[in-house]
């Protein structure tokens, strides 16, 4: 499975969307887990509602929220108030009994906000410029290329 690399700013929210075939995964709960080491187990962070028809309702564990649109085949995970310690390798999983099928591997990278490290007074923005062209203004970004991890 290819690994998707997602970047988010520290202190902000990062939204992850994992898509799957709604029919193949019919009736299955979804989970978000954190990979402990390259070959280690995947530690469950949060899973969708125990009643499958209610999977669209948000379930929270700490600063991580999960919700599943089981008809469209999209499970969405939101990592709120992103911290440096949240960086790492995660998995979206589809649960069937005691088995877990990996839907997607996600590498989360946390970017430090450059404003935190400098005096805002040192920054100068031309009056006529309403935005930084090409600057990163999204709360989260996804690299277009997919990086493969073993």
């Amino acid at each position: 499975l290819n690994t998707t690399v997602l970047q988010g700013m520290a202190g902000q929210s990062l939204r992850v969307s994992c898509t799957y075939d709604a029919l193949k995964h019919w009736g299955r709960r979804k989970a978000w887990c954190r990979q402990l080491g390259e070959e280690g187990p995947c530690q469950r962070v949060v899973s969708t509602h125990g009643v499958w028809l209610l999977a669209f309702l948000k379930k929270r564990n700490g600063s991580t929220v999960i919700a599943d649109d089981t008809l469209a085949g999209t499970v969405t995970i939101t990592l709120k108030n992103l911290q440096a310690g949240d960086a790492g390798l995660y998995q979206c999983q589809s649960l069937r009994g005691r088995e877990a099928e990996v839907l997607q591997k996600v590498l989360v990278e946390v970017l430090e906000d450059p404003l935190d490290d400098q005096d805002a007074g040192d920054l100068w923005v031309p009056e006529e410029s309403s935005s930084f062209e090409g600057a990163q203004v999204e709360h989260s970004t996804s690299r277009n290329q997919e990086t493969s991890f073993p």
């Epitope: 709604a22 029919l23 193949k24 009736g27 669209f56 008809l71």
Partner: antibody, heavy 119, light 107 residues
Framework: QVQLVQSGAEVKKPGASVKVSCKAS????????MSWVRQAPGQGLEWMGV????????VYAQKFQGRVTMTRDTSISTAYMELSRLRSEDTAVYYC????????????WGQGTLVTVSS | DIQMTQSPSSLSASVGDRVTITCRAS??????LAWYQQKPGKAPKLLIY???SLQSGVPSRFSGSGSGTDFTLTISSLQPEDFATYYC?????????FGQGTKVEIK
């Protein structure tokens, strides 16, 4: 026992809309997804879409996108399917069918509603 | 969309016969296949799901097998009430699709 009772036959003119109802009994309406399948005279079965009765979320077959609307009223355990801009090819028997969570197969079906589109 | 092809499209058989209907998927659907029986003027009735699981209340003379792209519905000993049209349905890839049907007639 589980029952899905559909509204009666309809005759519509091309361009009109039709709304078919499906009243569920004998089980918890919000515990199962509801789908709609149609069958033209002498033809096979064609899946139209599905609704989650709790959230109201829907997914429609591409062929019917923009023409079909599936809704529900949980207070009376009833699902609805509305098809607009009818044409003669929409003449068919329309079935509601319940989907259990253990498999995407249709375990109980309504008796069917014949919709005839004719000028 | 996945195409489901049933064969034969119709067959004639006698009471007590062993009847086999096949269904082929245009791509691998694992074991995500269901079989239905439909009698004239009636709604379809679920017989088999997940290729081989018998739906509650369905007689044990009905059985299903297969995986991947090729599937079979077998009626071990045809009964008078079994004369009907049979449909397969794949439920492994969106959207779900049906075969064109196999009509089982009295010889």
């Amino acid at each position: 026992q589980v029952q899905l009772v559909q509204s009666g036959a309809e005759v519509k003119k091309p361009g009109a809309s039709v709304k078919v109802s499906c009243k569920a009994s004998g089980y918890t309406f919000t515990g199962y997804h509801m789908s709609w399948v149609r069958q033209a005279p002498g033809q096979g079965l064609e899946w139209m879409g599905v609704i989650n009765p709790v959230s109201g979320n829907t997914v429609y077959a591409q062929k019917f996108q923009g023409r079909v609307t599936m809704t529900r009223d949980t207070s009376i355990s009833t699902a609805y399917m509305e098809l607009s801009r009818l044409r003669s090819e929409d003449t068919a028997v329309y079935y509601c069918a319940r989907i259990p969570s253990y498999t995407y197969a249709f375990d109980y079906w309504g008796q069917g509603t014949l919709v005839t589109v004719s000028s | 969309d996945i195409q489901m092809t049933q064969s034969p499209s119709s067959l004639s058989a006698s009471v007590g016969d062993r009847v086999t209907i096949t269904c082929r998927a245009s791509q691998d659907i694992s074991n995500y296949l269901a079989w239905y029986q439909q009698k004239p003027g009636k709604a379809p009735k679920l017989l088999i799901y997940r290729a081989s699981s018998l739906q509650s209340g369905v007689p044990s003379r009905f059985s299903g097998s297969g995986s991947g792209t090729d599937f079979t519905l077998t009626i071990s000993s045809l009964q008078p009430e079994d004369f009907a049209t049979y449909y397969c349905q794949q439920h492994g890839h969106s959207p779900t699709t049906f075969g064109q049907g196999t009509k089982v007639e009295i010889k």
